[in-house]
Structure formats: C-alpha cells, structure tokens
Interface confidence: medium
C-alpha cells in the first residue's frame, strides 16, 4: 500500500502480512496486507486492528477489527463507545456510510481515525497530536511503527521509476521495474492517467499513485481508493500547505 | 453477515416513531426497497444465513402483498427514535482528563496535530 | 439447537443493581437482535427493550430509559441486562428473546427467565 | 404510551372456536406490520405463536390463526383443545408505542 507517514513522507511499501502501523502507549494499530495479484510484491489492506488501551476513568480497552468486506460500526464487543467509565463517550464510533466509511473519535486522545472500504480493500487515515505520536515508552520496539519509521528500505517500491518506465513504453511492463509481472495487460496508460485525472486533477504524488494502481491491478476501485485518501487528508491534515506532495525520495526508514 | 443491520434499519424507518411509514403508503415501498438494497450488499457474505433468507423472503413477501414495484425511490435510514445509552453526546459530566483539548489548553496553546494514512496498493 | 439460557435467580436490596446474562448458542448471535421482557408475578408481560448485538444499537422502553442498560458480548455469545436502582416494583421473572428474522419485529426463541427479587 | 387492550379472560369447550381481540391505535396497530401473538402456559416462558398478524412459525398447529381489521388485531383458535388452555398475549413492535397487551385468559371447559 502507499503510506503518508506522520513527517509527510511518501512511500509504496510491498509490506506483506500484519505489520503495525502506530504503537504507542495509548492505541495500537496493525494492518494486515495481501498481495493485490498472484505473484504481484504489491501489496493492499486486507485487515485493519485498533486496539484502544485502557485509559484513566476514560475508557476501558477496546478493541476494533475491519476485513474485507467487513466494516462493523462497533468494537468487537458490540459496543460503540468506551465502555462503562466515567468518560466512555470519549471514545465514539460513528458510521459514515453503511459498510463504507467509518470514524472513530478518541477525544481523550485528541485522535481521529478514518477507516473505509474501496473496492476489496481498505484505506486508514488517522489525525493525532504529536505528543500521543510521540507517547512511546519503549523506542526499540514500539518506536518501528510504520507511521512514524516508514517502511523499511527493501520493503519499498520505487514507483516514480515505475511511473516513468510506463510512460515510456504505454501498456507494456518493464521486468525491473514492474511489482506485478502477472498484472494484467489490458489497462493502457493512456487510460489510467484519464481515470486518475478525472478523480484527482492535480498531478501530486496521490495522482502518481492511482496511475501506478491502475497500472498494476487494472482495478478502478483505486481510484477511488487514492481520492478518499486525499479527502482524508484534506479533512485530518492540520497543514492546509501540505495536502499535496509532489517531490519525492527513496526515503531511509526513521 | 449483516443482516441484522439491514432488519433494524426496516424495524426502524416502519415502527410508528416520526409518522410511520405506515403498510399501505407510498414509504412503505420505499423502505422495503431500502431494506431489500441493504440486503443485497450484504447477500456475499450471508450465504447460509437463515436469519438472512428468511429477510429475503419476507421482503418478497412485502413487496407482493402491498403492491410494490421493484423500482423507484428508497428511504433514508431513519434515526432510532431514543438514543442508546452511550451513544449520547459526550457526557456533561465526563471527566476533563477524557478531553485532550480542553486539558492541553490548561497549560499549553493548541496541540499540533499529525497525519498518517495508508491507501491502495 | 437454537437456545437462550440464562443466569440464576438473584435477591437484591431496593437501590441496588443487577445485571443478568442470557447465552446464546445453536444459531448467528450477530444475526438476530435480542429483547429483554419481565413479568411481576401475577402479572402481564413488560417489554424492556432491546439490542443489536451486530451493532450496539439498542432501543429503551421510555419509561426505563435511564435506569436500564442492553450489552453483548460477541465472542461469548452472551447479552445482558443491567437494571440500576431497584425497587420493590422491579421484582420480576426477566426473560431474553432472540428477536425473529427477516423484516418482521416478534420474539422468537425465548430464555427460561430469571428470577430477581428486590426486598429489603 | 397507548395501550393495547384485550379481554381478561375467554372460554370455550373442547372442538370450539374462541377470538382473542388486541385493540390499539393506528400507529400500535392499525399500521403496523409488527403485531405478533404469545401463548404462556404457568411458570413457563412465552413462546410465540403467531408475527405479522397472520404468519404461523413451523410447529405451531394451523387452528391457530390471526387476522387485523382497523385498529384490533385478533388471534382465532379453531378446534379448542385442553393444551390451548393459557394466557395469550398480543405484541406490537412500534417505536415509542412498543407494547404487549394486558393479556387474556383462555379457558377450556
């Protein structure tokens, strides 16, 4: 999946399988990623868990789960809020759209998360303060969260090279450069850069990201997916001047 | 499976709160064809549900019994008539320390705010 | 086979709480809503309300509203029922019912009761 | 919160019908989908007889029967039999208005 890390970097890892996304000493989170085709190193969202801990007279430890096709309004304990506490409708589940879109407000926490289903998979968007971000009592371990970190350096794909490569040659895949030998043949660029253009006019690395999608799964469902992201953006990103990123490196993780 | 979603949504949009759509009105229909969509989404992962084929029957049914036609407008989920325990707004009396903002403003300006997201493939 | 069992027979003093459990088993807990209904002795069935195990949702009888609170747990496949302030009037037989499926609201399958008798 | 009112009681020889009525409000009743019928036997649990008016659950016996007509609801039982001796009770699913009748004793002779 592509990851916007909390320092606004951009990045397309190949992580497979659970990896955690943040860890802090208030919530964890873990996604749980698959390859999008047989064969294919890239990677989407097949399962997402939050796990709140166990707050003061807030909230008791709750723990929320989304799979494919599978996007509950409630914690795994059925509730939607909290917990019995005092302060248990400082953490809120709110469902947006029916099986689509949901939020989950920890006020406690100042954070807001976003989790929605596009197409089989799902996206994660969350809005924090810096000193929960930064609430880590064991940096060794938890201090590796994706969010923070980023991806290790060979879990990335470089798809501007990718991006490059087909432009260059239209619809056909360059070995070296391809994450998806197997993808299907049938998604020309032409078109993946009309689709893209139609949901995200501004040609920043979110644009970048729904040509390299099209190009490797022949699914217009990421589209969809890199739109929602950047609406995510728009809404949680506290920088208005940051919504778009444009330049962008092979990043070293940390 | 999420059937049970699907029949509180119909038990509530006909359940006489907020002027009914009562079994012979044109909002009858339209929220039995919200019910039957929502069932539809559903329908993947509800194989072998019993709860969920006897909604798709019992819409049938509806749809036969009060002259329904398949297509045309559907109805907006309404809201439950009482609010859940909970899932009220957030409690007068709940606790400063549960409210990050409102603590932080004690001894500090505006938090800064991060983001991270993940998307696609 | 589909059945609702529930927790035992319980004294409470008047300003106390209870809270009763009913388990399911043989059918989709998530499926299927469950009321709460209690019968004082001698007298008529009382609907108390009931709750969406699939989402939380829940819906009071107006006149408990406050003083009664609908949970379940999902992975024991297990709903409650927590009455908070009792009094003398509150001594009843409270049974669960597993809500029937499709889009017609009745009770379907029902718990054996469970006894709660408040007395100081 | 309306009522729903039924008799206290309504008796009848084995082989006999008996009517049960359940009388509401349009919103309780009259427009509701959701009328559905108890039988509870003494220290047992209710156990549902009858849901939308008329529909019948597997394993309950077809002298059973319910129709509506305005406002009231009722439960028929044709062929009265010394097991049907019990008190019945008339739900309506409805929102604010969610209610069981007061109940109705029925006899058999």
């Known amino acids: 999946p592509h990851l916007r890390t909390f320092t606004d970097r951009f990045q397309t890892c190949k992580v497979q399988g659970a990896w955690p996304l943040i860890d802090n000493n208030y919530l964890n989170v873990q996604v749980t990623n698959t390859p999008v085709l047989p064969g294919s190193a890239a990677t989407a969202t097949s399962k997402l868990t939050i796990i709140f801990k166990n707050f003061q007279e807030c909230v008791d430890q709750k723990v929320y789960q989304a799979e494919m096709d599978e996007l509950p309004a409630a914690f795994v304990d059925g509730s939607k809020n909290g917990g019995d506490k005092h302060g248990a409708n400082s953490l809120k589940i709110t469902e947006k759209v029916s099986g689509q879109h949901v939020e989950i407000q920890a006020k406690y926490i100042g954070t807001t998360i976003v989790v929605r289903q596009v197409g089989r998979y799902l996206t994660f968007a969350v809005r924090m303060p810096e000193e929960v971000v930064n609430a880590v009592e064991d940096w060794d371990s938890q201090g590796l969260y994706l969010c923070l970190r980023g991806c290790p350096l060979n879990q990335q794909i470089d798809f501007q090279a990718f991006h490059t490569n087909a432009e260059g040659t239209g619809a056909r895949r360059l070995a070296a450069a391809s994450p998806a030998p197997t993808a299907p043949e049938t998604f020309p660029y032409e078109t993946a850069v009309a689709k893209c253009k139609e949901k995200l006019p501004v040609e920043d690395l979110y644009y970048q990201a729904c040509v390299f999608d099209l190009l490797t799964t022949g699914d217009v469902n990421f589209t969809l997916a890199a739109y929602y992201a950047l609406e995510d953006v728009k809404m949680l990103h506290s920088n208005k001047d940051k919504l778009h990123l444009y330049e962008r490196t092979r990043d070293l993780p940390g | 499976c999420k059937i049970l979603k699907c029949n509180s949504e119909f038990w509530s949009a006909t359940s006489g709160s907020h002027a009914p759509a009562s079994d012979d009105t044109p909002e009858f229909c339209a929220a039995l064809r919200s019910y039957a969509l929502c069932t539809r989404r559903t329908a993947r992962t509800c194989r072998g549900d019993l709860a969920y084929h006897s909604a798709v029957h019992g819409i049938e049914d509806l749809m036969s019994q009060h002259n329904c036609s398949k297509d045309g407008p559907t109805s907006q989920p309404r809201l439950r008539t009482l609010p859940p325990a909970g899932d009220s707004q957030e409690r007068s009396d709940s606790p400063e320390i549960c409210h990050y903002e409102k603590s932080f403003h004690k001894h500090s300006a505006t938090p800064n705010y991060t983001h991270c997201g993940l998307f696609g493939d | 086979e589909v059945q609702l069992v529930q927790s035992g027979a319980e004294v409470k003093k008047p300003g106390a709480s209870v809270k009763v459990s009913c388990k399911a088993s043989?059918?989709?807990?998530?499926?299927?809503?469950i009321s709460w209904v209690r019968q004082a002795p001698g007298q008529g069935l009382d609907w108390m309300g009931w709750?969406?195990?699939?989402?939380?949702?829940?819906n009071y009888a107006q006149k408990l509203q406050g003083r009664v609170t609908m949970t379940t747990d999902t992975s024991t496949s297990t709903a409650y029922m927590e009455l908070s302030s009792l009094r003398s009037e509150d001594t009843a037989v409270y049974y669960c019912?597993?809500?029937?499926?499709?889009?017609?609201?009745?009770?379907?399958?029902w718990g054996q009761g469970t006894l709660v008798t408040v007395s100081s | 919160q309306s009522a729903l009112t039924q008799p206290r009681s309504v008796s009848g020889s084995p082989g006999q019908s008996v009517t049960i009525s359940c009388t509401g409000t349009?919103?309780?009743?009259?427009?509701?989908?959701?009328v559905s019928w108890y039988q509870q036997h003494p220290g047992k649990a209710p156990k549902l007889m009858l849901y939308?008016?008329?529909k019948r659950p597997s394993g309950v016996p077809d002298r059973f029967s319910g129709s509506k007509s305005g406002n009231t609801a009722s439960l028929t039982i044709s062929g009265l039999q010394a097991e049907d001796e019990a008190d019945y009770y008339c739900?309506?699913?409805?929102?604010?208005?969610?209610?069981f009748g007061g109940g109705t004793k029925v006899t058999v002779l």
């Open positions: 043989g059918y989709t807990f998530t499926s299927h809503g």
């Open positions: 349009s919103s309780s009743v009259g427009d509701s989908i959701y």
């Open positions: 939308d008016v008329t």
């Open positions: 739900f309506s699913y409805a929102g604010t208005d969610t209610l």
């Open positions: 019912a597993r809500v029937g499926s499709g889009p017609y609201y009745y009770m379907d399958v």
């Open positions: 709750i969406s195990p699939y989402s939380g949702n829940t």
